[in-house]
């Protein structure tokens, strides 16, 4: 079999509040009921895990309570939101999708979404 295809946008600009959202879509070769989604950040050949969630098809994604990620799922699409981003967090955010159950296991890795984060300028002191 070929690698499971995972599609995600090439570029996203985070909001002034440090929030970035993007869709991760995968071409499921089978009827998966349990899916694991992991967001990885790649910068200068270093890769770190940003967040991960396992969900049952038709149910909501559940990230850990202290996660900077939230998300929803619809069919083979996952809508991901990352918050609390700062300029130093600019990088390539890669969506990794694993079809955990039923067997066989499938793994697909997206080509990444380049998220640009620009720290807001501080407000000038007001005379009023």
């Amino acid at each position: 079999c070929k690698a499971m295809h995972v599609a995600q946008p090439a570029v996203v600009l985070a909001s002034s509040r440090g929030i970035a959202s993007f869709v991760c879509e995968y071409a499921s070769p089978g009827k998966a009921t349990e899916v694991r989604v992991t967001v990885l950040r790649q910068a200068d050949s270093q890769v770190t895990e940003v967040c991960a969630a396992t969900y049952m098809m038709g149910n909501e994604l559940t990230f850990l309570d202290d996660s900077i990620c939230t998300g929803t799922s619809s069919g083979n699409q996952v809508n991901l939101t990352i918050q609390g981003l700062r300029a130093m967090d600019t990088g390539l955010y890669i969506c990794k999708v694993e079809l955990m159950y039923p067997p066989p296991y499938y793994l697909g890795i997206g080509n990444g979404t380049q998220i640009y984060v620009i720290d807001p300028e501080p407000c000038p002191d007001s005379d009023f």
Partner: nanobody, 126 residues
Amino acid sequence: EVQLVESGGGLVQPGGSLRLSCAASGFSSDYYDIGWFRQAPEKEREMVSCIRSSGGSTKYADSVKGRFTISRDNSKNTVYLQMNSLRAEDTAVYYCGLAPISPVHAVCNQHYFGYWGQGTRVTVSS
């Protein structure tokens, strides 16, 4: 279905050599990372060595540099790990892993692996 089948493990004396083989099947992409990982009792799985299918970039753990050599035979979909000057601390179960990556992904990063073989045991003891 992706299958990775390891062979070549066994018992060897310190200073000895072994050659591990990993035969991959069920995967038709011509771009991937494939490599060897090991897990000793009570320890986490660690990357030993890895090679990129296209271009042949390789990566080695510091602890095996100069002693282990990874190679591949694309016509047989097989990757080999030649292990020389074996030490007691090399004792572990050795797993073959595959990562279905593309050129944008960092070479041989453990986060991208997900397909695993069943493992072959290597014991270095006198």
